[in-house]
Interface confidence: medium
């Protein structure tokens, strides 16, 4: 996270840590005891194998992320249409082989339902460990900042990125740049708080660089893949 | 909700086994169409911010809130679970319906067990004047928004 | 008020086992690591070992990796250390602490009592 | 592991005077604005006592005669005035990664 600040206990309980042979690679979002919300682009093969990864809960700090504190992953679902190349469809989930234990520090996001209204420049966070700077490296400590939303239709302008939005992504940060997700945030959350409620809107997933002025952080569009995520759950159930 | 990224037209419903489109009409009718049965496993949603409790109406091929008459936990429960969600049902209330509904779901308390969708029937007046709201999680509290002052 | 509660002393041969107790009131036991420390007689004090009551995995200090066995009961709120093998040097106070890992400031707010391990034949 | 080097091994203060102890950590324990630094009092025959968490905030109930300052590899925990109940033994600790690791302790003693 560009441009953001180390987080508080607890205030983004629902944000995993994802490794792979102990180094964090991406971040999560919780949305039940046993069902991880992150981006499909981090489970491309050969990291579509679930013994790769590792999840962490409720835990800030990177060096505090040892083995046995982490739970295993029992099984990677890539979204179908996932596209590499655009990176539409950016969306995949992870189910735990043993359930979380929720506590302060450990909760799940909500899925945004459908008729829920977001004003074109809606306040949204971000959280992860990714660098804090363009090619910096990945943060020890979990930080978030505050992005707006951007409407698709500035996002894709000629000057900003041109009709590669697609409605199955959604636009967040500010134009001017300065704040923005970065490498190593992948597939955490964008979130925003409506009647005293966190809701996922976001995956973090694709941007130009990171921070920069008029190339704001790109997102999976959580609202589109509601459906496709109760139908996975409930098709393991 | 289940139409979004569908490659039927704008009428029909994409069954997720296989691809192929099928009548609206025959959606949540209580007959499978879909190879994998999924026409009949979709028939609940929860809409808005309030969690409002909407069933799907193969009659109106439209999405209906439900009506709190009669409404117990038990149903919350089933609702959840048909959502995809295990052990996890959380609470229902009644909410006032400010959406301007003049169309609702109820229960037909007397129907034997079967999936809550076939006790549900039409009607154009829900006496209690609240709908269904349900939580099938604790979602989406930080620590911040639990601590609210007194 | 938040207490972690040691039986006061131990007497064990040398080449047993002893398992070492310490349980949790006043607090919510799975929110925090439980932490054991050694401090030999006059001396300074030595991180063994911590245990997350959440997952039950364990994370050692290398030296101590094959002495000593970490382990949780979630449902009495207690947490075990068992050393085995033992020689004159395990003769020491053992300490559980407490460490908010979620706060990520790690660092220990409440000890136990302490148990005192006396090895000898 | 981070070695974490104590000084003076021991002192002895008079009442009423400043004691000022060390701790140098053999590489940085400051990270993302913080200082995993942190200091505990023990007394013969009790467990330690958390006195000042990450270098320099105070653990609620703790006199404010008790400070700490420092970062990067270099912290110090200050007495003043010292008082009769605080000869003691002082140890830092840091957790800026596990395995978190202690100072060899330092003996306050009064004249």
């Known amino acids: 996270i560009v441009g953001g600040e180390s987080a508080l206990p607890g205030a983004w309980p629902w944000q995993v840590s994802l490794h792979v042979q102990n180094v964090h690679v991406c971040g999560g979002s919780i949305i039940t005891p046993e069902w991880i919300v992150t981006a499909a682009h981090c489970v491309e093969k050969p990291l579509n194998n679930p013994w790769h990864w590792t999840a962490f809960a409720g835990i800030l700090r990177q060096s505090f992320m040892f083995y046995g504190a982490g739970y295993q992953v029992e099984k990677v679902i890539s979204h179908p249409n996932y596209d590499s190349k655009t990176k539409n469809n950016d969306i995949a989930l992870m189910k735990l082989q043993k359930p979380l234990t929720f506590n302060d520090l450990v909760k799940p996001v909500c899925l945004p339902n459908p008729g829920m209204m977001l004003q074109p420049e809606q306040l949204c966070w971000i959280s992860g460990w990714g660098a804090t700077e363009e090619k910096g490296k990945t943060s020890e400590v979990l930080n978030a900042a505050k992005v707006l939303l951007i409407e698709t239709q500035r996002c894709n302008s000629r000057y900003v990125y041109d009709n590669l939005i697609t409605p199955a992504m959604i636009c967040a940060g500010f134009l001017q740049g300065n704040v923005d997700s970065c490498q190593g945030d992948s597939g955490g959350p964008l979130v925003t708080s409506k009647n005293n409620i966190w809701w996922l809107i976001g995956d973090t997933s694709w941007g130009s660089g990171c921070a920069k002025a008029y190339r704001p952080g790109v997102y999976g569009n959580v609202m589109v893949f509601t459906d496709w995520i109760y139908r996975q759950m409930r098709a393991d159930g | 909700w289940k139409f979004m990224g569908s490659k039927c037209s704008n009428s029909g419903i994409e069954c997720d086994s296989s691809g192929t489109c099928i009548n609206p009409s025959n959606w949540c009718d209580g007959v499978s169409h879909c190879p994998g049965g999924e026409d009949e496993n979709r028939c609940v949603r929860l809409y808005g911010p309030n969690f409002i409790l909407q069933v799907y109406s193969s009659q109106r091929k439209s999405w209906h809130p439900v009506c709190q008459d009669d409404w117990s936990e038990g149903y919350g429960r089933a609702a959840c679970q048909d959502m995809g969600y295990r052990n996890s049902f959380y609470s229902s209330q009644g909410i006032v319906d400010d959406s301007g509904s003049t169309s609702f779901m109820k229960l037909n308390t007397s129907a034997g067990n079967v999936d809550i969708y076939k006790k549900l029937y039409h009607s154009d007046a829900c006496s209690s004047k609240a709908v269904v709201s349900l939580r099938c999680i604790a979602c989406g509290v930080n620590l911040n928004s639990s601590r609210q002052s007194r | 008020q938040v207490q972690l509660q040691q039986p006061g002393a131990e007497l064990a041969k040398p080449g047993a086992s002893v398992k070492l107790s310490c349980k949790a009131s006043?607090?919510?036991?799975?929110?925090?690591?439980m932490h054991w420390v050694k401090q030999r007689p006059g001396q300074g004090l030595e991180w063994i070992g911590l245990?997350?009551?959440?997952?039950?995995?364990?994370n050692y200090n290398e030296k101590f990796k094959s002495k000593a066995t970490l382990t949780v009961d979630k449902s009495s709120r207690t947490a075990y250390m068992q050393l085995s093998s033992l020689t004159s040097e395990d003769s020491a106070v053992y300490y559980c602490?407490?460490?908010?890992?979620?706060?990520?400031?790690?660092?220990?707010?409440?000890w136990g009592t302490g148990t005192t391990v006396t090895v000898s034949s | 592991d981070i070695v974490l080097t104590q000084s003076p091994a021991s002192l002895a203060v008079s009442l009423g005077q400043r004691a000022t102890i060390s701790c140098r950590a053999s590489?940085?324990?400051?990270?993302?604005?913080?200082?995993?630094m942190h200091w505990y009092q023990q007394k013969p025959g009790q467990p330690p006592k958390l006195l000042i968490y990450?270098?320099?905030n105070l653990e609620s109930g703790v006199p404010v005669r008790f400070s700490g300052s420092g970062s990067g590899t270099d912290f110090t925990l200050n007495i003043h005035p010292v008082e009769e109940e605080d000869a003691a033994t002082y140890y830092c600790?840091?957790?800026?990664?596990?395995?978190?690791?202690f100072g060899a302790g330092t003996k306050l003693e009064l004249k």
């Open positions: 590489e940085s324990v400051s990270t993302s604005g913080y200082s995993y």
């Open positions: 006043g607090y919510t036991f799975t929110s925090y690591w």
């Open positions: 602490a407490r460490w908010d890992y979620g706060s990520s400031y790690g660092y220990f707010d409440v």
């Open positions: 990450l270098a320099s």
């Open positions: 600790q840091h957790s800026r990664e596990l395995p978190p690791t």
């Open positions: 245990i997350p009551p959440n997952s039950g995995s364990s």
